[in-house]
């Protein structure tokens, strides 16, 4: 017969290190008689041995956690008691170890130059992983701008273009190493104008090239504005090299203007723009036209073919490099503008413009152009095209330039000779003489004041029908 013997733990518990999902076993070998009851605690709380996560062997002397979890970390104790003497206890720690795991990896970032970029890299692991970063193929060195935060995130102050590239974070502990996927840091740069267009003072009908160079990431787009509106004529040539865009606007100058180069690039939902402006002014060309040389020749163009008298000689101004082409281009431009005007105004305006640009010519030792008679000019301005003229002048006062007639090379009526002073010194417009016969088709005009359709006429006149100033016989 065996003598009773109080329990003695012959194999005290030791600290156990286990990875998540691994097996962890504590051994508590006990010698005693009779056989002891062995219970187990974790952090002083009794372990329920019917929990299927645990395995008990050899009468409780082996406790196994079949698949370790983070939460199993703690102090485990075995307590042996057989009723002989006191209960005995032995304790040991379970340290749940974990290979490094990147729980919040970095993501692709687009950042504007000069701002602060933060690439996240949150990790888990036991022992706590150290985090480092790789840029391209090389370990990233920290400096006054670049730092790896306690959290593992990479912070870059005052981002520079050279910070762009591919990054990955590396989490390392004694159990292993984890790498994030490669992410791209893209540095965006606000659009900036490197070379602004230059202002020009040129003669009427000259060609001018305005050049504008801009840089940015992404490469900016360049648009041109003429007096507040998109450029309607001219050709644009663009080239891009090394994130620099070079835009050249070639213009045929028929009027002065303010030309603005606008460089734009997009950053997410926002845009950045840079602007530079240049003026193109025209050297006083009405004066130079008087002084300038020219020649008389038959009109060979197309635009005014139906308006000008057949086989008439017209004046070509040699202050233009290529007078016939230059004047034809001017009228062509004007013709397109006239698409916007009323059916009443258009034919009258066409007659006025063709006869103004292609003036009747008296050949001689000095070829002399014959301007339009003032009365015909005023008729177009204040009767046929009154609405359009009024709109144009109103917009000009308010700094707005868009109307059907603002681009037209119209004469200044007040500066033209009067047919009453010298009927041979100016040109009549046959179209208006013909229209006079059908005066009933015009808007009704009272004998005292003009209607709202007609601008206020000079004080000496009251209506088209009675004014001697408008008499066309």
């Amino acid at each position: 017969e065996k003598l009773p013997k109080a329990p003695v733990i012959t194999t005290p518990l030791e600290t156990v290190d286990a990875l998540v999902e691994e097996v962890a076993t504590f051994m508590c070998a006990v010698e005693s008689y009779p056989q002891p009851e062995i219970s187990w605690t974790r952090n002083k709380i009794l372990i329920k041995l019917f929990d299927t996560r645990y395995s008990i062997r050899e009468n409780g002397q082996l406790l196994t956690i079949l698949s370790v979890e983070d939460s199993d970390d703690g102090i485990y104790c075995c307590i042996a008691n057989n009723g002989v003497g006191g209960a005995v206890e032995s304790c040991g720690a379970l340290q749940v170890k974990m290979k490094p795991k990147i729980t919040r990896p970095p993501i692709n970032v687009k950042i504007i130059e000069g701002l602060k970029a933060v690439l996240p890299c949150t990790t888990m692991g036991n022992p706590k992983p150290s985090v480092s970063w790789i840029k391209g193929d090389n370990a990233l060195r920290e400096n006054s701008r670049i730092a790896v935060l306690e959290s593992g995130s990479l912070r870059i102050h005052n981002v520079q273009k050279e910070d762009a590239g591919q990054y990955r974070c590396v989490a390392k502990n004694s159990l292993g190493t984890a790498y994030s996927k490669l992410v791209k840091l893209e540095v965006e740069v606000f659009a900036r104008i490197l070379r602004a267009p230059e202002s020009h003072n040129v003669t009427f009908g000259s060609f001018v090239t305005l050049r504008c160079t801009a840089i940015g990431i992404p490469v900016p787009t360049i648009s041109w504005i003429e007096n507040g509106n998109a450029v309607s004529s001219g050709s644009i040539q663009e080239s891009v090299k090394d994130r620099v865009i070079d835009s050249r606007l070639q213009l045929f100058i028929t009027k002065p203007g303010l030309y603005t180069c606008i460089a734009t690039n997009k950053h997410g939902e926002k845009f950045s723009t840079a602007k530079a402006a240049a003026t193109v002014s025209i050297a006083e060309w009405s004066k130079s036209q008087k002084d300038s040389q020219g020649y008389c020749a038959q009109y060979r163009g197309e635009v005014c073919d139906a308006v000008l008298a057949k086989d008439a000689l017209v004046f070509f101004n040699t202050s233009y490099r290529d007078p016939e082409d230059a004047q034809e281009l001017l009228i062509h431009t004007a013709w397109n503008e006239l698409k916007a005007v009323s059916p009443l105004c258009r034919p009258a305006a066409e007659a006025l413009l063709c006869n103004h640009l292609f003036q009747e010519c008296s050949p001689g030792v000095v070829p002399t152009p014959m301007p339009i008679c003032r009365e015909y000019c005023l008729a177009v301005k204040e009767l046929f095209c009154a609405k359009e003229w009024q709109a144009m002048e109103g917009k000009a006062h308010r700094g707005l330039y868009r109307s059907g007639m603002h681009l037209l090379p119209v004469p200044e009526c007040s500066k033209l000779p009067s047919m009453h002073r010298d009927p041979t010194a100016c040109t009549r417009l046959p179209y208006l003489d013909y229209k006079k016969e059908n005066i009933t088709t015009f808007p009704s005009i009272t004998s005292s004041r003009p209607s709202a359709d007609i601008p206020n006429l000079p004080a000496s006149t009251s209506s088209f029908a009675v004014s001697p100033a408008y008499s066309m016989t």
């Epitope: 194999t11 030791e14 156990v16 290190d17 286990a18 990875l19 691994e22 097996v23 076993t25 051994m27 070998a29 056989q35 395995s55 008990i56 062997r57 050899e58 009468n59 002397q61 082996l62 196994t64 079949l66």
Partner: antibody, heavy 121, light 107 residues
Framework: EVQLVESGGGLVKPGGSLRLSCAAS????????MAWVRQAPGKGLEWVSS????????YYADSLKGRFTISRDNAKNSLYLQMNSLRAEDTAVYYC??????????????WGQGTLVTVSS | DIQMTQSPSSLSASVGDRVTITCRAS??????VNWYQQKPGKAPKLLIY???TLQSGVPSRFSGSGSGTDFTLTISSLQPEDFATYYC?????????FGQGTKLEIK
């Protein structure tokens, strides 16, 4: 002297059943954890199942769970292995072994001579 | 399950040679490793338990070492009766696993 003697092996058709027995003597059977270990012809050892002395704790190899059942009768000092839905790959010598707590962990310190189970049509 | 990877799978040696067999566990298992010897047509026999403790009656030319994941069985001077197959086994998990065995043959 510890003695373990297996019986019940033989030829069985695939899908058939067989019950192996192990008669133990020379030690306190009821206090000992017992196990079955098998060895396919020309292959290595493979643990099959274990049962604690009081039958409260039973373990099976994952690959066999559901088809094999271990049991014991302490009054008869006998260990059993009920094998159902037998497959050709269950063909092996089946050993009965005693598990013993050692300085670290447990080991099979006593083995029977083995019984051959052949599963074939 | 814990895998036990044994190497080499076979080994030719001569009487008197020193022989080493290794076993690697798929996770840390402290010293919960046993070594068995099996001769053809016989049941296995426990040689070493707890990684390094010699089972009673086993000759002292057998020794074991290792902890954590890497374990070694060494026979310091091979005797004719030592030609057999050797197995490692882990008992850290209650789902016991054996190595695939190393067959030690006479050169």
């Amino acid at each position: 002297e510890v003695q373990l003697v297996e019986s019940g092996g033989g030829l069985v058709k695939p899908g058939g059943s067989l019950r192996l027995s192990c008669a133990a003597s020379g030690f306190t059977f009821s206090a000992s954890t017992m196990a079955w270990v098998r060895q396919a012809p020309g292959k290595g050892l493979e643990w099959v199942s274990s049962v604690s002395g009081d039958s409260h704790h039973i373990y099976y190899a994952d690959s066999l769970k559901g088809r094999f059942t271990i049991s014991r009768d302490n009054a008869k000092n006998s260990l059993y292995l009920q094998m159902n839905s037998l497959r050709a790959e269950d063909t092996a010598v089946y050993y009965c072994a005693r598990e013993r707590l050692l300085r670290l962990g447990v080991g099979f310190d006593s083995w029977g001579q083995g019984t051959l189970v052949t599963v074939s049509s | 399950d814990i895998q036990m990877t044994q190497s080499p799978s076979s080994l030719s040696a001569s009487v008197g040679d020193r022989v080493t067999i290794t076993c690697r566990a798929s996770q840390r298992i402290s010293g919960f490793v046993n070594w068995y010897q099996q001769k053809p047509g016989k049941a296995p026999k426990l040689l070493i338990y707890a990684a390094s403790t010699l089972q009673s009656g086993v000759p002292s030319r057998f020794s074991g070492s290792g902890s954590g994941t890497d374990f070694t069985l060494t026979i310091s001077s091979l005797q004719p009766e030592d030609f057999a197959t050797y197995y490692c086994q882990q008992s850290y998990s209650p789902l016991y696993t054996f190595g695939q065995g190393t067959k030690l043959e006479i050169k």
